[in-house]
Amino acid sequence: QPSVSPGEPSPPSIHPGKSDLIVRVGDEIRLLCTDPGFVKWTFEILDETNENKQNEWITEKAEATNTGKYTCTNKHGLSNSIYVFVRDPAKLFLVDRSLYGKEDNDTLVRCPLTDPEVTNYSLKGCQGKPLPKDLRFIPDPKAGIMIKSVKRAYHRLCLHCSVDQEGKSVLSEKFILKVRPAFKAVPVVSVSKASYLLREGEEFTVTCTIKDVSSSVYSTWKRENSQTKLQEKYNSWHHGDFNYERQATLTISSARVNDSGVFMCYANNTFGSANVTTTLEVVDKGFINIFPMINTTVFVNDGENVDLIVEYEAFPKPEHQQWIYMNRTFTDKWEDYPKSENESNIRYVSELHLTRLKGTEGGTYTFLVSNSDVNAAIAFNVYVNTKPEILTYDRLVNGMLQCVAAGFPEPTIDWYFCPGTEQRCSASVLPVDVQTLNSSGPPFGKLVVQSSIDSSAFKHNGTVECKAYNDVGKTSAYFNFAFKGNNKEQIHPHTLFTP
């Protein structure tokens, strides 16, 4: 029994004066607590607690369930205990079958013994199955068997407490271990879409998916730079004992322009936190913005190909697109497609493929696009570069030599005189008159130039060359002169193409 200094309160004394007492089932338990300030006896086993205000605790016919710790307490709060085993060969274990563990923590299999003298007190797997190799335990006859550092893999493990009695193995009722997992990583969060574009009045709904090992993960939607509590709806699934999924859906039933901003889905557990954001842009009405991918003024050589390409942003989705030339709509030769397959895509591409363009096919090509809110258009001015063509080359009645050439860009006409039989006409002749004539063709067509020289300047036989040229090429026409006496004649004019 404990001894204390005189004058200090001392704990009660118990008879019999030992820490453990073994009695047989059916025998009497008689415990006496001696203390002038006696308050109560308390009996504890598993989750059961009983009290007795008598200083003598008497159980006439002891049962296995009377096994447990008997504590006597005095008015100073000091106490003394004795542990009583009620040996019952038919009931070797007292059990509380609830068995819960936290991953990486110890947990107690509550199967205290009624007989401390049995041997090989341990755990066994159900139906003869072996326990996990790494499972470590410490037996304590008064409390049960402590499993050390519970693993996630032990979840749903079926086991028995076991002892050897008279050479035979005796098993308790079965226990099923339920393990609550520890968080060993941050939650995995994802969002249904990274950005949303809406018109005023439309519903905004975005879903955040949170995945973790258990439902105790915390999650919330937050508006960046705002403390306003957002209305969320949750759904969840237990895809497995350690595979939990929550969907947190944020809804604004009628979005306004000032709802635009960044929304964050935030999740945390005891390991750490994770977040993902989505951007909402609310516009008062739809829009279309067109961006030409090439210059809107296009120069192309005769017979070559050109692609007119636009990118455009359209919200809501484009409904009608067309390419127009000279009030005619193209039914083919063009394609229109989204810039990306992303669900949030608002950017599109339209391409008109013009092949082997003729000089007569210059002009304004217009792309038109519309959606339910707006229309938009862009025009391309296409100029077809053509080498000059000499339309007329004549000697006029007034003695003038006239050369008319057409082409694009505007041709330049130069005159040369070749005396005698020389092949090369190098001596240039200044024109008397040069005019750019209005073309009768469509706009963006060939430009017509007329140039004249005075033939009276020529005193010898020879050839006059009219050379029309531009960036694309050149063409020449020739006038042959022969003098008969004092008369000058124009002999058959002819043209010669010089590439």
């Epitope: 979840h155 439902s215 915390y218 949750y234 759904n235 699934w237 004992d241 929550r246």
Partner: antibody, heavy 120, light 108 residues
Framework: EVQLLESGGGLVQPGGSLRLSCAAS????????MSWVRQAPGKGLEWVSA????????YYADSVKGRFTISRDNSKNTLYLQMNSLRAEDTAVYYC?????????????WGQGTLVTVSS | EIVLTQSPGTLSLSPGKRATLSCRAS???????LAWYQQKPGQPPKLLIY???TRESGVPDRFSGSGSGTDFTLTISSLQAEDVAVYYC?????????FGGGTKVEIK
């Protein structure tokens, strides 16, 4: 010993409000998810709302969404259900139920219930 | 939402007889996340079976559960007078959590 004690029920007119409480004892309240389940007179069980033990998830049946709010005060070991815009069909015994240790939505302990009557 | 349909609505049997209660789900209940509860008159429900077939601590072994996917069964191997109650199945795989309509077990 686990105990759950509901209170706050009573007679209320349609459109009115009530706040139910559930006082918990005998276990570490903050370690467990909790739910409210109701039972209309002579009818079956209907899950109403749940709250995670970290407070990290609040769930509602469609029939009460937007009208009822679940909350908890771990310092007081108490679960609450704020019920607004009450309707006749909300008349029921309301039970608070404790999740099992290892999994939410599975209930190993229930209170005795509190009766809510919505009538004019 | 997973809808649970219980049958029969009422089961009347003599003591000692075998009672078989059925619970059918509108879609698969993954991982056998299905429970059975017993509710006696004037009392709250009591958990009997979870994981479709695991008996809760303290539940007599005459109660057993079986099944997976969409079809589940609660069996009382030898009906006792104290088993008179309404029995509910419940899925806890996904929210909203749902209960079956219940089967009333009576003694004939």
């Amino acid at each position: 010993e686990v105990q759950l004690l509901e209170s706050g029920g009573g007679l209320v007119q349609p459109g009115g409000s009530l706040r139910l409480s559930c006082a918990a004892s005998g276990f570490t309240f903050s370690d467990y998810g909790m739910s409210w389940v109701r039972q209309a007179p002579g009818k079956g069980l209907e899950w109403v709302s749940a709250i995670g033990y970290g407070g990290g998830g609040k769930y509602y049946a469609d029939s009460v969404k937007g009208r009822f709010t679940i909350s908890r005060d771990n310092s007081k070991n108490t679960l609450y259900l704020q019920m607004n815009s009450l309707r006749a069909e909300d008349t029921a015994v309301y039970y608070c139920a404790k999740d099992t240790w290892w999994l939410a939505g599975l209930f190993d302990y229930w209170g005795q219930g509190t009766l809510v009557t919505v009538s004019s | 939402e997973i809808v649970l349909t219980q049958s029969p609505g009422t089961l009347s049997l003599s003591p000692g007889k075998r009672a078989t209660l059925s619970c059918r789900a509108s879609q698969s209940v993954s991982n056998s996340y299905l429970a059975w509860y017993q509710q006696k008159p004037g009392q709250p429900p009591k958990l009997l079976i979870y994981w479709a077939s695991t008996r809760e601590s303290g539940v007599p072994d005459r109660f057993s559960g079986s099944g997976s996917g969409t079809d589940f069964t609660l069996t009382i191997s030898s009906l006792q007078a104290e088993d008179v109650a309404v029995y509910y199945c419940q899925q806890y795989y996904s929210t909203p959590l749902t209960f079956g309509g219940g089967t009333k077990v009576e003694i004939k």
